[in-house]
């Protein structure tokens, strides 16, 4: 049978071998291999000016493996497309291109955005933060003690960092002032230890500067985020007044 | 030398089946791939599909429901059934073989036989 | 399936004339193009495989190129035995589909 298929390949190709390299069911000098053992991937292979048939166990990077009745070859992925599963799948896009669901875009559709160290069209994350936590004693000079007015704290943790095109974070920290009964210093007192809960580090790109107080100090240039978050803050300075007036704490 | 030859009846019937026979000779046919194509009134070639060297077989999404191409390695033949055929199915119908995509695609063919379909 | 097209549909040419048929590929078939020649009342024959490869016999003034999506075949000085139909085919994927055909005649 195999002396059938040389003969007959013969005409066409002179040189025509059944003792092949690599692979090869049928192959010529001229042409290396014209056809491929079974379950091996036939590919063209370019020496130069020169294109030479190849078979392989799996097919090279910018190619996918078909697989027909008795013949397999390598096909070559969409032009945009580096890595692809078949035609209509890419898994790399070639520089330049965004990978979305297998598909390979100039730019990412509404919605979503470049990640451009992937290279892929991403969901836009917007910033997430925590429940405000408890609001600090009441402290004045880093003391709890031997004054009336002083300020007090809180601030609330980042859950989930934005994304290039997502909503910025708004305050992590809040101050604003407190009204205590002044409380004698015990000799050696200075009214920090145990009783101060440890103030969380600023978060990284995160300066205490930036940290509003209730005395409404505005940066001179306001993002309308910005804006807005102060307007919440108002709001909720004013939901506290109402909570605490049972409280000595007093907001001014 | 590799020899093609169609033979099979020139008038088929609205609705019935058209069998085609391909004798090979000079080549076995346990070897490489072995198609059937037909050419329309018009001049349009179409690729209808192959039975390879181990029998299996590959057909044309058009037609996959109403195809079969078989074999007899024994006579060195293979078949073309195909059913329920219309007047659209009045061709030129080749048989012709290829081995492999380094190599010359339908390198030969049969001198063709042409089935009208017609009552 | 890959859609070939090509052009011209006919075409009259002088003999000695260079003559040039392209076909288009509706994709990119990575040089799996084949030629076929076919005069009246006869099957078809492979002039050209993989591009740009003559098969055994045929006339040294028949040439092939392209890549990607688009395919020539060149008749670089016409004879009278080269009127006939000419016929494109990919077979980068199944179902291999040919072009619709260029009808050569001499003027």
């Known amino acids: 049978q195999n002396a059938s298929r040389g003969r007959r390949q013969r005409r066409m190709h002179p040189n025509v071998s059944q003792g092949c390299q690599g692979g090869c069911a049928t192959c010529s000098d001229y042409n290396g291999c014209l056809s491929c053992k079974p379950r091996l991937f036939f590919v063209l292979e370019r020496i130069g000016m020169k294109q030479i048939g190849v078979c392989l166990s799996s097919c090279p990077s910018g190619y996918y493996g078909t697989r027909y009745p008795d013949i397999n070859k390598c096909t070559k992925c969409k032009a945009d497309c580096d890595t692809c599963f078949n035609k209509n799948f890419c898994t790399k896009c070639k520089s330049g291109f965004y990978l979305h669901l297998g598909k390979c875009l100039d730019n990412c559709p509404e919605g979503l955005e470049a990640n451009n160290h992937t290279m892929e069209c991403v969901n836009i994350v917007h910033c997430e933060v925590s429940e405000w936590n408890p609001w600090s004693p009441c402290t004045k000079k880093g003391k709890t003690c031997g004054f009336k007015r002083g300020t007090e704290t809180r601030v609330r943790e980042i859950m989930q960092h934005p994304s290039a095109k997502g909503n910025l974070c708004p305050p992590t920290n809040e101050t604003r002032k407190c009204t205590v009964q002044r409380k004698k210093c015990q000799k050696g007192e200075r009214g920090k230890k145990g009783r101060e809960r440890k103030r969380k580090k600023p978060n990284k790109g995160e300066s205490k500067e930036a940290i509003p107080d209730s005395k409404g100090l505005e940066s001179s240039k306001e993002t309308p985020e910005q804006r807005e978050n102060k307007q919440q803050q108002k709001k909720r300075k004013v939901q506290d007044k109402q909570q605490k007036s049972v409280s000595v704490s007093t907001v001014h | 030398e590799v020899q093609l030859q169609e033979s099979g009846p020139s008038l088929v019937k609205p609705s019935q089946t058209l069998s085609l026979t391909c004798s090979v000779t000079?080549?076995?046919?346990?070897?490489?791939?072995w198609s059937w194509i037909r050419k329309f009134p018009g001049n349009k070639l179409e690729f209808m599909g192959y039975i390879s060297f181990s029998g299996k077989t590959y057909y044309i999404p058009s037609l996959k429901s109403r195809v079969s191409i078989t074999r007899d390695t024994s006579k060195n033949q293979y078949y073309l059934q195909l059913n329920s055929v219309t007047t659209e199915d009045t061709a030129t119908y080749y048989c012709a073989t290829y081995h492999g995509y380094g190599g010359p695609w339908f390198a030969y063919w049969g001198q063709g036989t042409l089935v009208t379909v017609s009552s | 399936d890959i859609k070939m097209t090509q052009s011209p549909s006919s075409m009259y040419a002088s003999l000695g004339e260079r003559v040039t048929i392209t076909c288009k590929a509706s994709?990119?078939?990575?040089?799996?193009l084949s030629w076929f020649q076919q005069k009246p009342g006869k099957s078809p024959k492979t002039l050209i495989y993989?591009?740009?490869r003559l098969i055994d016999g045929v006339p040294s003034r028949f040439s092939g190129s392209g890549s990607g999506q688009d395919y020539s075949l060149t008749i670089n000085s016409l004879e009278y035995e080269d009127m006939g139909i000419y016929y494109c085919?990919?077979?980068?994927?199944?179902?291999?589909?040919f072009g619709a055909g260029t009808r050569l005649e001499i003027k």
């Open positions: 000079g080549d076995s046919i346990t070897s490489g791939y």
């Open positions: 994709q990119d078939i990575d040089s799996y």
């Open positions: 085919l990919q077979y980068d994927e199944f179902p291999v589909t």
């Open positions: 993989l591009t740009n």
